[in-house]
């Protein structure tokens, strides 16, 4: 910390300009008052300050503002918000996206700090929710911020705002991610016609559950082997051979290369053998013919 | 993203050296430069300035009518002639962009040693 001392005669600061690189730190503490950092904070970011007077320049307006910066200074902070720290956040009310959208530009490029972690926290749980214009900038920035999110998180991100989330915004999701978004992404595109919605709901499909496949295989989709192999196993152990097969189309060839990756090799324990062959595609490891196929879960409910 | 400085090395009290700041990555065209310099022990100071348009220039008063700044947008490099050297400007200089789109990038260079004895 920067020990008080007095502004040297002529010295005193009459706006934020490039001649306050030539202040030593103890000179900018005596000689810039904070109220007027605070109104030409957008000055600031065009002058190449070093970082110890920066830090300089952060210690003043934490003076002026003790319980926590306006938004008004917030937005222009640019990147003196890169020694902002979590606990410094958390004392600040962001509610407009523009400020959001700011203050993510200066970290652009960079993985997520926890600094904007905790900017998008505030910023979220002061919306009361993820509305779409929050997701559409939040993903442009960091695409992978979606599948960060816990199920429970997942949960407050209304339908209407999958229309921002595009297929690279999931790659990183789990299951149980998945299992949250996916009737979100169902009630979002219920309106649209067969292989539109298709399109749109293909890369939510690892939240699906087995009606629902069960349903596609009736509407010529095609679906994709690496879609596929991203479905839940537990949705594709039902599917019979002919539902499978007609899932997939003309990527039902696929399935030999994957036979023994899950689900494939799962799926392919349960169907019958001769189910199997009727794909002439070589696949082994189904029910021998003449065998009884017992369902123990069912047993085990009864005993 | 890098700025790296070049044109450091030993000089006699009195002599000359040009300091070079280029940009690899980015284009310098929209930054404010700064050219910082650290002697051993010492705090970091600043000791010239120019604008990104390179219309507005700015000198410590040590260096003023010794160091002059200017930039070179179309070679992405901004120099500090330094002449008169003294003892006194021995240090690391290095440079320092500010502005860039929404004035929200920074960069700084590793730096480069100039001895003056």
């Known amino acids: 910390e920067v020990e008080k001392t007095a502004c040297p005669s002529g010295k005193k600061a009459r706006e934020i300009d490039e001649s306050l690189i030539f202040y030593k730190k103890w000179e900018l503490e005596a000689c810039v008052d904070a109220a007027l950092l605070a109104t030409q904070m957008d000055r600031v970011n065009a002058i190449p300050f070093t970082y110890e007077q920066l830090d300089v320049l952060k210690h003043k307006l934490d003076e002026l503002y003790p319980q926590g910066y306006p938004e008004s200074v917030i937005q222009h902070l640019g990147y003196l918000f890169l020694k902002m720290s979590p606990e410094d956040i958390r004392k600040w009310n962001v509610t407009s996206l523009e400020t959001l959208k700011a203050l993510l530009e200066v970290n652009k490029g960079h993985e997520m700090s926890p600094q904007v972690a905790t900017l998008i926290d505030r910023f979220v749980k002061g919306r009361g929710q993820l509305d779409k214009d929050t997701l559409d900038t939040l993903t442009a920035f960091y695409p992978g911020y979606l599948c960060s999110l816990s199920p429970e998180e997942l949960s407050s991100v209304p339908p209407s705002s999958i229309w921002a989330v595009r297929p690279q915004d999931l790659d990183t999701c789990d299951p149980r991610q998945l299992d949250v978004l996916y009737p979100k992404a169902r009630l979002a595109f219920q309106n649209m016609n067969g292989s539109e919605y298709f399109v749109k709901i293909q890369s939510f499909l690892g939240g699906a559950p087995t009606e629902d496949l069960k349903a596609l295989s009736q509407q010529n989709v095609s679906m994709d082997l690496a879609t596929f192999m991203k479905l839940r196993t537990d949705a594709v152990l039902p599917l019979t051979v002919a539902e499978v097969q007609k899932l997939l189309g003309p990527h039902v060839e696929g399935l030999k290369a994957e036979e023994r990756h899950r689900p494939v090799r799962d799926w392919i324990l349960r169907q019958r053998q001769d189910d199997l062959d009727t794909l002439g595609l070589g696949l082994q490891g189904g029910i021998p013919n003449g065998y009884l196929v017992l369902d123990l879960s069912m047993q085990e409910a009864l005993s | 993203l890098q700025l790296v400085e070049s044109g450091g090395g030993l000089v006699q009290p009195g002599g000359s050296l040009r300091l070079s700041c280029a940009a690899s990555?980015?284009?310098?065209?929209?930054?404010?430069i700064g050219w910082f310099r650290q002697a051993p022990g010492k705090e970091r100071e600043g000791v010239s300035y120019?604008?990104?348009?390179?219309?507005?220039?700015n000198y410590a008063d040590s260096v003023k009518g010794r160091f002059s700044i200017s930039r070179d947008n179309a070679k992405n490099t901004v120099y500090l002639q330094m002449n008169s050297l003294k003892p006194e400007d021995t240090g690391v200089y290095s440079c320092a962009a500010a502005g860039g789109y929404g004035n929200s990038s920074r960069h700084w260079g590793q730096g480069t040693s100039v001895t003056v004895s």
């Open positions: 120019i604008s990104s348009s390179g219309g507005s220039t």
């Open positions: 990555g980015f284009t310098l065209d929209y930054y404010a």
